[in-house]
Amino acid sequence: SPVPFGPEGRLEDKLHKPKATQTEVKPSVRFNLRTSKDPEHEGCYLSVGHSQPLEDCSFNMTAKTFFIIHGWTMSGIFENWLHKLVSALHTREKDANVVVVDWLPLAHQLYTDAVNNTRVVGHSIARMLDWLQEKDDFSLGNVHLIGYSLGAHVAGYAGNFVKGTVGRITGLDPAGPMFEGADIHKRLSPDDADFVDVLHTYTRSFGLSIGIQMPVGHIDIYPNGGDFQPGCGLNDVLGSIAYGTITEVVKCEHERAVHLFVDSLVNQDKPSFAFQCTDSNRFKKGICLSCRKNRCNNIGYNAKKMRKKRNSKMYLKTRAGMPFKVYHYQLKVHMFSYNNSGDTQPTLYITLYGSNADSQNLPLEIVEKIELNATNTFLVYTEEDLGDLLKMRLTWEGVAHSWYNLWNEFRNYLSQPSNPSRELYIRRIRVKSGETQRKVTFCTQDPTKSSISPGQELWFHKCQDGWKMKNKTSPFVNLA
């Protein structure tokens, strides 16, 4: 495989050295200005010190300039996501310069070798940017480096080496192996640009994490917790999108970052929001749907600059395909129990009814366990915009079918054979929309009928004004 030589990152194909025709030394990195929406078009190759191609290819010095940086490659060809991203950028920013950084010869190697080449590729990009800065009207502030996987760290090096500060770097699932826990100057970091935003879509706490787990930007967004992406499971991929193996599942999840970014470019009317949270579990509990103090942001291209934040972890749920936007809701449910039946967790579902649409039957995911005689918070999300919420239906499906729960059922039955029934009392549900930040309280229609048992349902409507004042007494006062 070809390897770089010298500080300029020159390339020689050692594999074919004996042939005289193979010893020609060439720059290891090429810059292709995509001049047409036609993905087959060869574009224009730019090189430092050669101004003619800039004129011939109508390089717009005052416009935004995007540099797309691919990652490690097993095939040595540009993957299909590349022209999708190029096309999306052209669609969104019609006057912009879109440059593809072709470092395929240095990326088409053993992963460890490709990692060792990232620095030299970053240097090449920095040299190109330094040269462009010599031109009138070109501003580094208008430069946006978009790096996928290993390319994200290349972007970091470029931002580090360039004279001045690049406007923005977007890291699309930055590579994890050999970068996790690395020194700030040996990976993408917030210091590499005026604004560094990152999408993490393949992080794993067990096994090999293809994407980096640690936050490396000003804002680090973890869609679906940054790990299992909807539509990328083996079941989903076997019958579609040409992904039929574990390798393809990995590819699907890793590449999801690119598609989320493309989505943010082309579906401007359906922007996805992410919410700041300390960890994925807290987000899954529905605790983190606040937009106060810049705690929420658009994802992808539409992300708002937040330079005061560093390594701010943000979360969201998404659909399985474009448009990825979902609508997040926080449900605060105060649960009392008439008959506490041990550790068995109820399997609860909610259906939301809105002015525009109704949701499906949505599971209330129990992240840890339901606390009785306490307020429990849940996160639910819908794929469609329901509009204003009008009412909701809560159903109890009985116990979750795990061996643990079945054993608990049996144990509880043995300990209280005379009273095996279980009952929850839920008087009201407070709902907050993540997208609109609106809060609405829903009450049972009849305060005296607020109990639910397995196999039953309970309906909630918007609370009447003053309902809470009238019903201040606890339903349990006479139960002693």
Epitope: R30, E40, H41, G76, I77, A242
Partner: antibody, heavy 120, light 112 residues
């Protein structure tokens, strides 16, 4: 106009070596990848692999690893296919075909083909 | 590797009629709304010639009587009305992401 012109027919004995050329014109040679495709007599098309015309890095499919070598003479805008230790089953017509690095990788221009006959 | 199965292996169609050739892939060749399936025509003693790219796009200079359709795993090449010069062997090819890229076995079209 864009053309890929291949070298003439070859008659070889088993165990010998052959080198087929494919000269490109009408476009910037290094801006497109070059494929090689085999077609045995009366059979279908079989993709052998491709070469990056800029870096010179070849990629071979599993069936064509070992005796087959893709190479370049960039200054002459020419790609080569060399087959070593020829066998009877190498008797076929070999085509070069270009593809765009940036698009959907279909083969838009083909050489006229070089017929190789391997016989003792 | 993705296997492409063409059917029929050969067909005879009367002048002016419709010829329909099918290509089935062993797994989807779609990617984000695009189908990476292409069709070529090869006449005896000649190299293949690109007719249709990305399932349904007509290559420039190819007559409009050629059309392609399909997505996922099922693709079709239609020729209507068939002309004398269309007698040839037709191949489908997939180039979805990582190689190896593969060709179908070919369909020989004869004009009655």
């Amino acid at each position: 106009q864009i053309q890929l012109v291949q070298s003439g027919p070859e008659l070889k004995k088993p165990g010998e070596t052959v080198k087929i050329s494919c000269k490109a014109s009408g476009y910037t040679f290094t801006n497109y990848g070059m494929n090689w495709v085999k077609q045995a007599p009366g059979k279908g098309l079989k993709w052998m692999g491709w070469i990056n015309t800029y870096s010179g890095v070849p990629t071979y499919t599993d069936d064509f690893k070992g005796r087959f070598a893709f190479s370049l003479e960039t200054s002459a805008s020419t790609a080569f296919l060399q087959i070593n230790n020829l066998k009877n089953e190498d008797t076929a017509t070999y085509f070069c075909a270009r593809f765009s690095y940036y698009g959907r990788h279909y083969f838009d221009y083909w050489g006229q083909g070089t017929t190789l006959t391997v016989s003792s | 590797d993705i296997v492409l199965t063409q059917s029929p292996a050969s067909l005879a169609v009367s002048l002016g009629q419709r010829a329909t050739i099918s290509c089935k892939a062993s797994q989807s060749v779609d990617y984000d709304g695009d189908s990476y399936m292409h069709w070529y025509q090869q006449k005896p003693g000649q190299p293949p010639k690109l007719l249709i790219y990305a399932a349904s796009n007509l290559e420039s200079g190819i007559p409009a009587r050629f059309s392609g359709s399909g997505s996922g795993t099922d693709f079709t090449l239609n020729i209507h009305p068939v002309e004398e010069e269309d007698a040839a062997t037709y191949y489908c090819q997939q180039t979805n992401d990582d190689p190896p890229w593969t060709f179908g076995g070919g369909t020989k079209l004869e004009i009655k």
